[in-house]
Each structure stands twice: as structure tokens, then as C-alpha cells.
Interface confidence: medium
């Protein structure tokens, strides 16, 4: 018979042969042969694999470093990674929760929509057209662009979400 060019779901092709993938929580020890099944072994105590796989090494569980304000929210299993969260009153700096902040700052181009409270983090919003923020701040809202017209000036440089407009004198036609 012709050797296969594709395999079923939860199988992989090796040496012109379809072998079973290892189930989540197990790693590959040896590929199948004509006569033997794929050999898999369970991941160790602090390891995991979360997909059907042919990995020869399991991944280490994430470490929730208390020096970064992290603690374990959900202990990892052989099939799932550890989930970290922040100590009481602190907030994750990202979805992955790799470090903690008392309250998050809004980057330039973003302003504070709602200042943090004891239970909720800072809420940021993008500065709309006509507004800017040039600082990283946990408190400052987007500021409106300077109105050159009210100062009897003209716009020399357009504003952005991160910079104010630059005003300059009007060009006066000489008589």
C-alpha cells in the first residue's frame, strides 16, 4: 500500500507512517513503529502540556514571583499552566499578569477615563481627535488642543493624540 501523505486528527506523520499524538499532560518518549504504539510519559510535578502533542519535553509551570507582587490564583496541573494574580489591592500590568502595579498609568496618547479605586484599576481611553496626552499618567485626562484662533494665531503644526498643536503668527500681506 501507498505510504500516507496525511494523517487523521490526533496523529502525526513520521517515517511515512501515522503515529498517535500524546494526549495533553503527557510527552513523547518514542515514535511508533510498524510494530509498536507511540510511547508517551506523564509530565512531572511542576510541568504541563496543554495540547495533543509530540513534544519531548513538558513546559514548566509559570512561577508566581512574590517579589513582583504575584500569587497563585489557580495551581497548574499536568494539562494546564499555573495562573498568577496580584496581591490584594494590586493590579496586573497585562493580560499575562507578569507583574503588578498599585494602579496602572495610561500611556501617551491615552487619558484617564476613571481614576483607580481600592478595588478597580485605572481605566484608560484613547485621546479622540482634538485632544492629546503627552505623559504617562495614572490621573491625567486627555487635554484639548490649544485653540490658535482664540489667540489670533494660526496652526503651524497639526496636533496628534500625543502632541498639542503648534501655533504661530498669521502671515500678514505687505501693502
Amino acid at each position: 500500500p501507498e505510504p500516507p501523505t496525511a494523517c487523521r486528527e490526533k496523529q502525526y506523520l513520521i517515517n511515512s507512517q501515522c503515529c498517535s499524538l500524546c494526549q495533553p499532560g503527557q510527552k513523547l518518549v518514542s515514535d511508533c513503529t510498524e510494530f509498536t504504539e507511540t510511547e508517551c510519559l506523564p509530565c512531572g510535578e511542576s510541568e504541563f502540556l496543554d495540547t495533543w502533542n509530540r513534544e519531548t519535553h513538558c513546559h514548566q509551570h509559570k512561577y508566581c514571583d512574590p517579589n513582583l507582587g504575584l500569587r497563585v490564583q489557580q495551581k497548574g496541573t499536568s494539562e494546564t499552566d499555573t495562573i498568577c494574580t496580584c496581591e490584594e489591592g494590586w493590579h496586573c500590568t497585562s493580560e499575562a499578569c507578569e507583574s503588578c502595579v498599585l494602579h496602572r498609568s495610561c500611556s501617551p496618547g491615552f487619558g484617564v477615563k476613571q481614576i483607580a479605586t481600592g478595588v478597580s484599576d485605572t481605566i484608560c481611553e484613547p485621546c479622540p481627535v482634538g485632544f492629546f496626552s503627552n505623559v504617562s499618567s495614572a490621573f491625567e485626562k486627555c487635554h484639548p488642543w490649544t485653540s490658535c484662533e482664540t489667540k489670533d494665531l494660526v496652526v503651524q503644526q497639526a496636533g496628534t493624540n500625543k502632541t498639542d498643536v503648534v501655533c504661530g503668527p498669521q502671515d500678514r500681506l505687505r501693502a
Partner: nanobody
């Protein structure tokens, strides 16, 4: 190397006043929003007040609004916290902070005890 050194704490009676200072070095002071936070005995960290880099905008926790005043002198790289009408619940170690990341640069703090 970033350094923050708080001073001015001490024992004061309820209703009294204190002025805390924080001497900063190792970074461009006026570029940063600066903060005061405190930790009461056996409690978590509580944010107290913040001030913009240029010193024009100030922010306060509800618990200290109207009693505390934050200010800064960028020419001296120093942050201040004027505390008036002090109460027993203001007893805490006060820290100035450059940013509020858990592992970021914090001073060692200065202890304020409000007691009769």
C-alpha cells in the same frame, strides 16, 4: 541609581501637623508623576496622593482630601506632603514612589504615629 529618601515622620497628637519630605536622585525628577503611599500597621498599601511632573496638578485619596497637600520643588528634586488635622487612622509608614510598580523604586519610608 534611583534613590528616594523620606524624612519628617514622628509622633504627633491628633489634630497636629507634620511635613514629610522625599529627596530624589538618579533620575530626571521633573519627568515623573510622583506619589505618596502609606502602609498602616497590619494593613495593605494605600495610595495617598500624587502630583504631576510640572507640579500643577494634584490628586488625593478621599481619606486625606482637604487635610493633606502634596507639592514638589523640581529645582531641589524634592517631594513634600503637608499633613494637617492628623487622625489616629493616619498612623502608618509613608513612602514616596516614582512609579507604582510592585518592584519599582520605593523609598524606605518614614513612620508617622498619631497618638495622644
Amino acid at each position: 541609581e534611583v534613590q528616594l529618601l523620606e524624612s519628617g515622620g514622628g509622633l504627633v497628637q491628633p489634630g497636629g501637623s507634620l511635613r514629610l519630605s522625599c529627596a530624589a536622585s538618579g533620575f530626571t525628577f521633573e519627568w515623573y508623576e510622583m506619589q505618596w503611599v502609606r502602609r498602616a500597621p497590619g494593613k495593605g498599601l494605600e495610595w495617598v496622593s500624587a502630583i504631576s511632573g510640572d507640579g500643577y496638578r494634584t490628586y488625593y485619596a478621599d481619606s486625606v482630601k482637604g487635610r493633606f497637600t502634596i507639592s514638589r520643588d523640581n529645582s531641589k528634586n524634592t517631594l513634600y506632603l503637608q499633613m494637617n488635622s492628623l487622625r489616629a487612622e493616619d498612623t502608618a509608614v509613608y513612602y514616596c514612589a516614582k512609579e507604582l510598580l510592585f518592584f519599582d523604586y520605593w523609598g524606605r519610608g518614614t513612620l508617622v504615629t498619631v497618638s495622644s
